[in-house]
């Protein structure tokens, strides 16, 4: 940029050095050179000489006009052609920027990750503004009426120590830049309702050598929340479609979940949990890959259809990953999946 240029004259921009993208812009150059009556005044944008829409206003001043200026940033400078000088003489330079006023922040969400000591609020910023844009997060207690403000660029973490006075808050976000300001919708937050349990981790899996082999997946969390509802999704690595099982979990001990799976196949498992009856889910855990053992019998294997499994139709979802390399990105499909339970034996995956 041209921030510390020694000017021998002046350069100014109408409507201003930062303006709305797509506006018509006039840039003026006025020389104040000693011992020079310029033959010509020249404009340069990002180092390249401009040829068109230049008007000489008087002996000392010229203007360049841009229709619908749409570059986020440009470095403008102007020069004079002085008689008897081989090179052009620099007059002045300016950084100019164009951008957009901010969109109203949308999809404002606030959560407390268990043990983090923070309330984390995120939002969608909307279309790019191309200029410095800040977000002012307002947090107002519905009990004491006290309001706090936090400055953010894309998200904010607010220490729960500063939220001691009350449990219920109103949260909203203002997007501000030099071209405008917009407010998000207000979000009602009860601190007890936005806690996401400590991360759930799949620690290991094993496939038994029974006549009908079963895979047991072991998973755990350090959460102190008593009532936790979880989903485990799984699929073969060659498949795009996930199957999902639901569980009510009690993490005072390691969870064990049983699956009747295709033999000699590589499966990927992921788990996520939420406090029972609440809205916010953990992100899916890291993918855990397990290879089921080879089939020993000759019987035609039909998962979910063996005499050893009860068929119970559940309202659960089937999801399709966009790409096998991106297991976190998926689109929901409307489907019913059959959730299998072994006919006998101790199991903890009823839910």
């Amino acid at each position: 940029g041209i921030t510390s240029i020694n000017c021998s004259g002046d350069m100014w921009v109408e409507p201003g050095e930062i303006f709305q993208m797509g506006m018509n812009v006039s840039i003026y150059c006025q020389e104040a050179l000693k011992h020079c009556r310029p033959r010509n005044l020249y404009f340069y944008k990002n180092g390249f000489k401009e040829e068109f829409d230049i008007t000489r206003i008087n002996r000392t001043t010229a203007r360049i006009w841009y229709k619908g200026f749409s570059e986020p940033h440009a470095y403008m400078h102007c020069t004079a052609e002085c008689p008897g000088h081989f090179q052009e003489t620099l007059i002045c330079g300016k950084d100019i920027s164009s951008g957009h006023p901010p969109d109203a922040p949308s999809n404002l969400t606030c959560v407390i990750y268990e043990y983090s000591g923070n309330m984390t609020c995120t939002w969608n910023t909307g279309k790019p503004t191309y200029i410095d844009t800040k977000y002012i997060v307002h947090v107002k207690s519905l009990e004491t009426e006290e309001e706090q403000q936090y400055l953010a660029s894309s998200y904010v973490k607010i220490s729960t120590d500063s939220l001691q006075g009350s449990r219920k808050y109103l949260v909203w976000v203002q997007a501000v830049n030099s071209l405008g300001m917009e407010n998000s919708q207000q979000l009602h937050v009860h601190l007890d309702d936005i806690v996401i349990p400590s991360a759930s981790i799949i620690s290991r899996a094993e496939t038994t050598n029974d006549t009908v082999p079963k895979t047991i997946v072991y998973w755990k969390s350090k959460t102190m929340i008593e009532k936790v509802f979880c989903e485990m999704r799984y699929k073969t690595t060659t498949n795009q479609t996930w199957s999902v099982k639901e569980f009510d979990a009690n993490f005072t001990y390691v969870q064990q979940s049983e699956f009747y799976l295709e033999p000699d196949s590589k499966y990927v498992f992921q788990v996520r949990c939420q406090e029972t009856g609440k809205r916010n889910w953990q992100p899916w855990s890291s993918p855990f890959v397990h290879q089921t053992s080879q089939e020993t019998g000759k019987r035609n294997w039909q998962p979910w259809s063996s005499p050893f499994v009860h068929q119970t139709s559940q309202t659960v979802s089937q999801v399709t990953a966009k790409s096998s390399h991106e297991p976190q990105k998926m689109e929901m499909l409307s489907a019913t999946i059959f959730r299998g339970h072994p006919a006998s034996g101790n199991h903890q995956d009823i839910g």
Epitope: I18, D132, K134, Y150, S153, S162, S178
Partner: nanobody, 116 residues
Framework: QVQLQESGGGSVQAGGSLRLSCAAS????????MGWYRQAPGKERELVSM???????FYADSVKGRFTFSQENAKNTVYLQMNSLKPEDTAMYYC??????????WGQGTQVTVSS
């Protein structure tokens, strides 16, 4: 911890001018995004003007063309020049220092009263 002290408020007739000052101490306010805010009785505190790292300045629609934000880095001071004042500009005016991720720090405020 930065401390902010506003001054320059007072009573003025509609159409008059005032210049508010805000002096920062405690540490250089260069790490702050500085803003002027105001709160009228029974209303929420609202942002009046804020300066950005690219040198640009935001002005609320209600003050555009009448108020000017300026700063004097050597004195750790920011100013709000208020011209063509209107009765609806009557409020307590605060300057604020905001750093990313931190709670905004306010001064004690200075009262501006505009009578018609």
């Amino acid at each position: 911890q930065v401390q902010l002290q506003e001054s320059g408020g007072g009573s003025v007739q509609a159409g008059g001018s005032l210049r508010l000052s805000c002096a920062a101490s405690g540490y250089t306010y260069s790490s702050c995004t500085m803003g002027w805010y105001r709160q009228a009785p029974g209303k929420e505190r609202e942002l009046v003007s804020m300066v950005f790292s690219d040198g640009s300045t935001f002005y609320a629609d209600s003050v555009k063309g009448r108020f000017t934000f300026s700063q004097e880095n050597a004195k750790n001071t920011v100013y709000l020049q208020m011209n063509s004042l209107k009765p609806e500009d009557t409020a307590m005016y605060y300057c604020g220092c905001a750093t990313l991720g931190s709670r905004t720090i306010w001064g004690q405020g200075t009262q501006v009263t505009v009578s018609s």
